[in-house]
C-alpha cells in the first residue's frame, strides 16, 4: 500500500494548563524507518517527540505503539503552555545506513493554538 | 538495572503441556513488547513469539503457531509461554527477552531449560 | 533466511568483520547478539542496525546496507570470543529470523 501520513486536523485550541491530541496516521509501515513529531518547519523545526524509545516529558503516545501492525502515531502533550504554540508535523523517515535517516513523507501539519487559562 | 528471570523449565513427556514463566523487574514493563527466543541443544537462536506491550496483539513463528501461547500480566509484570502438545524438538532453553521500539532485542533472561524425553 | 559465515578468525588486535545477508533494506531492520557459551544468556551487542547499548564496547559497530548487514569488532580482543548471531525484523511480514551464527575465534 502506498504510503501517506495523515494529520486530520489543520489546528486544535487547547487551554493552558490542559492537555491535547496531535493526531497522526499512516497508511504503511513501509519503507520501515522511525516516525517523529517536529515543530516548525525547515533547518530550525524542533524534534518533539520520536518513536524510538525516547523518553519526553509530558509527552505520551495515544495508542500502544508496539503493536507490529501500528500506524497510529498520535501523541498527547500534557500541561500545555505558550511556549507549545506552533504547527506540529508528523513526519515519517526511511532507515539509513551509514548516512542519517531520510524524510520520505511528512503530514500537512497541525496548529496548535494556546488560550489563556 | 533490567532483569529478566525465566522459570518453570522442567522433563516432560511427549505430548505434555508446559508453562513457563518471566518475571521483569528494573524498567517499566508495560510500555515494552516482549519476545521468546529458543536454543535447542547445538543449534542457533530461534524466535518462537512476541507480544505488544498491552497483551492486545500477538505474533508466532509457522512452527509453533496454535501449540503455543504467548501472554503477560502487567500487573505482575510477568511474561508467559504457555506450551502445548510438546515433541522431543522443543527441547531447548527458553529465553525471554525485551524488544526495542523496532522489534529486535535489547535484553535477555539467563533462560530455563525444557527437556522432552519419554 | 539470514545467511551468516560459519567461522571467522582472527589475531587480537585485528579487525573482523561478520556479514549478514538476505534481509531486505525496504523491510528489515537487524541487530546483532554474543553468546559466549552455549545455553547461557545472549547480550546485544548492536541493534537497530548500528544503534550499540551503553554498556558494549565501542570496538563493536553495525552497519546495515543493501540486503546485508555488517558487524564490525576494531581491535578484537580475546574475550570477543563467542558466537555472533545477526537477527532481522521483517515490517512486511511481522516476523524476526535469526541467523545460524558466526563462530569468532581469537588466535
Known amino acids: 500500500k502506498e504510503l501517506k501520513v495523515t494529520q486530520p486536523e489543520k489546528s486544535v485550541s487547547v487551554a493552558a494548563g490542559d492537555s491535547t491530541v496531535l493526531n497522526c496516521t499512516l497508511t504503511s509501515l513501509l519503507p520501515v524507518g522511525p516516525i517523529r513529531w517536529y515543530r516548525g518547519v525547515g533547518p530550525s523545526r524542533l524534534l518533539i517527540y520520536s518513536f524510538a524509545g525516547e523518553y519526553v516529558p509530558r509527552i505520551r503516545n495515544v495508542s500502544d505503539t508496539t503493536k507490529r501492525n501500528n500506524m497510529d502515531f498520535s501523541i498527547r502533550i500534557s500541561n500545555v503552555t505558550p511556549a507549545d504554540a506552533g504547527i506540529y508535523y508528523c513526519v515519517k523517515f526511511q532507515k539509513g545506513s551509514s548516512e542519517p535517516d531520510t524524510e520520505i513523507q511528512s503530514g500537512g501539519g497541525t496548529e496548535v493554538y494556546v488560550l489563556a487559562k | 538495572d533490567v532483569q529478566l528471570v525465566e522459570s518453570g523449565g522442567a522433563v516432560v513427556r511427549p505430548g505434555e503441556s508446559l508453562r513457563l514463566s518471566c518475571a521483569a523487574s528494573?524498567?517499566?514493563?508495560?510500555?515494552?513488547?516482549m519476545s521468546w527466543v529458543r536454543q535447542a541443544p547445538g543449534k542457533g537462536l530461534e524466535w518462537l513469539a512476541g507480544?505488544?506491550?498491552?497483551?492486545?496483539?500477538?505474533y508466532y513463528i509457522d512452527s509453533v503457531k496454535g501449540r503455543f501461547t504467548i501472554s503477560r500480566d502487567n500487573s505482575e509484570n510477568s511474561l508467559y509461554l504457555q506450551m502445548n502438545s510438546l515433541t522431543a524438538e522443543d527441547t531447548a532453553v527458553y529465553y525471554c527477552?525485551?524488544?526495542?521500539?523496532?522489534?529486535?532485542?535489547?535484553?535477555w533472561g539467563l533462560g530455563t531449560l525444557v527437556t522432552v524425553s519419554s | 533466511a539470514l545467511t551468516q559465515p560459519a567461522s571467522v578468525s582472527a589475531n587480537p588486535g585485528e579487525t573482523v568483520k561478520i556479514t549478514c545477508s538476505g534481509g531486505?533494506?525496504?523491510?528489515?531492520?537487524y541487530g546483532w547478539y554474543q553468546q559466549k557459551s552455549p545455553g547461557s544468556a545472549p547480550v546485544t551487542v548492536i541493534?537497530?542496525?548500528?544503534k550499540r547499548p551503553s554498556d558494549i564496547p565501542s570496538r563493536f559497530s553495525g552497519s546495515a546496507s543493501g540486503s546485508a548487514a555488517t558487524l564490525t569488532i576494531t581491535g578484537v580482543r580475546v574475550e570477543d570470543e563467542a558466537v555472533y548471531y545477526c537477527?532481522?525484523?521483517?515490517?512486511?511480514?511481522?516476523?524476526?529470523?535469526f541467523g545460524a551464527g558466526t563462530t569468532l575465534t581469537v588466535l
Open positions: 527477552a525485551r524488544e526495542t521500539w523496532n522489534h529486535l532485542f535489547d535484553y
Open positions: 528494573g524498567f517499566t514493563f508495560s510500555s515494552y513488547a
Open positions: 507480544i505488544s506491550a498491552g497483551g492486545s496483539d500477538t
Open positions: 531486505d533494506w525496504y523491510s528489515t531492520y
Open positions: 541493534h537497530s542496525d548500528d
Open positions: 537477527a532481522g525484523y521483517d515490517g512486511r511480514t511481522y516476523i524476526n529470523t
